[in-house]
């Protein structure tokens, strides 16, 4: 469960892949599309509002206990729109929604080496936002093998 309905802090950052491709957002036919692309040097990077939440981590052993704390985030590139996990389609989409946000808009934030982070679906543990064919997608990760996979590593820069 998320401890508070208010974020503990918020920040604006641009989002890029491990390989320094930018995550951009474009309004097309009244809906937003998400792109992973090389930006021209003079082009300004899109910013995302990251809202951080403190959350309880459920105990995986007992099933009903609590095993400490974790940080969750929501990502909003523009007012009233949030990144959401579509677990059925294994896709990442931008949806307009009102608060309280649905669980699909929350991602566990993982601190990774090389100054990178990863975003794990709250609704589907072990599934992360990743890059596939120049798009964002949901990627299932085996903890014991692929947590360092470059395609689920992202950089946040102010």
């Amino acid at each position: 469960s998320i401890t508070g309905i208010s974020p503990i802090t918020e920040s604006l950052a641009s989002l890029s892949t491990y390989n320094d491709q930018s995550i951009t957002f474009a309004l097309e036919d009244e809906s937003y599309e998400i792109y992973v692309e090389d930006l021209k040097k003079d082009k300004k990077k899109d910013k995302v509002l990251l809202s951080y939440y403190e959350s309880q981590h459920p105990s995986s052993e007992s099933g009903d206990g609590v095993d400490g704390k974790m940080l969750m985030v929501t990502l909003s590139p523009t007012k009233d729109f949030w990144l959401q996990a579509n677990n059925k389609e294994h896709s990442v989409e931008l949806h307009k929604c009102e608060k309280p946000l649905p669980d699909q808009a929350f991602f566990v934030l993982h601190n990774r080496s090389f100054n990178c982070v990863s975003f794990e679906c709250k609704t589907d543990p072990g599934v992360f936002i990743g890059v596939k064919d120049n798009h964002l997608a949901l990627i299932k990760v085996d903890y014991s093998e692929n947590l360092g996979s470059e395609n689920i590593l992202f950089k946040l820069s102010e």
């Epitope: 918020e10 704390k69 946040l156």
Partner: antibody, heavy 119, light 111 residues
Framework: EVQLVESGGGLVQPGGSLRLSCAAS????????MSWVRQAPGKGLEWVAT????????DYVDSVKGRFTISRDDSKNTLYLQMNSLRAEDTAVYYC????????????WGQGTLVTVSS | EIVLTQSPATLSLSPGERATLSCRAS??????????LNWFQQKPGQPPRLLIF???NRGSGIPARFSGSGSGTDFTLTISSLEPEDFAVYYC?????????FGQGTKVEIK
């Protein structure tokens, strides 16, 4: 209940070797980053080494680089610290610590095991 | 490396009093908009216990009398009303970058 139990400490001569173990229980070990933190007698805390979940990355404090190796065996739920070329200044209680889920801070600590390097 | 300096080294107070502990970093411990500064409590013969993470968030099972504040380089741990079990050594620690570093500690003792 989440538990970390260290073992393997003891008295060793300068230049000697020791291997510390940390047996973890009560959580999915492979999902968590693990670390060793030490505390010299009557002194403060010093981070020693970290290994990520999935064994992908390791990091060490400069003073132990090339001498200490952190490793893990996820099938045995055990964390290790192989300590070679030990020096008097390595004398300390060594704590096994587990990061929180997401790897942002040291959340769970073992009781520690004492390593004494002396001739 | 980031050096953390805690003050005072020792704080002599009575139960029921308010304790204010300071931690100053040699450079900002902010990353991704988070202040990656944590506080631990350690009693003699025991391992440290997480009190506060990310500057102001209480760890699991930590009483509300413990609170953290601050950003950038200056941080404070406040114990609103000291209980007998609160007399201990308190450490701040940064998790912004390797090497992860701790302050030298503040001992809160009974006056």
């Amino acid at each position: 209940e989440v538990q970390l139990v260290e073992s393997g400490g003891g008295l060793v001569q300068p230049g000697g070797s020791l291997r510390l173990s940390c047996a973890a229980s009560g959580f999915t070990f492979s999902s968590f980053s693990m670390s060793w933190v030490r505390q010299a007698p009557g002194k403060g805390l010093e981070w020693v080494a970290t290994i990520s979940g999935g064994k992908t990355f390791t990091d060490y404090v400069d003073s132990v680089k090339g001498r200490f190796t952190i490793s893990r065996d996820d099938s045995k739920n055990t964390l290790y610290l192989q300590m070679n070329s030990l020096r008097a200044e390595d004398t300390a209680v060594y704590y096994c610590t587990r990061a929180n889920y997401g790897n942002w801070f040291f959340e769970v600590w073992g009781q520690g095991t004492l390593v004494t390097v002396s001739s | 490396e980031i050096v953390l300096t805690q003050s005072p080294a020792t704080l002599s107070l009575s139960p029921g009093e308010r304790a204010t502990l300071s931690c100053r970093a040699s450079e900002s411990v902010a990353k991704y908009g988070l202040s990656l500064l944590n506080w631990f409590q350690q009693k003699p013969g025991q391992p440290p216990r997480l009190l506060i993470f990310a500057a102001s968030n209480r760890g699991s099972g930590i009483p509300a009398r413990f609170s953290g504040s601050g950003s950038g380089t200056d941080f404070t741990l406040t114990i609103s009303s000291l209980e007998p079990e609160d007399f201990a050594v308190y450490y701040c620690q940064q998790s912004k970058e390797v090497p992860f570093t701790f302050g030298q500690g503040t001992k809160v003792e009974i006056k």
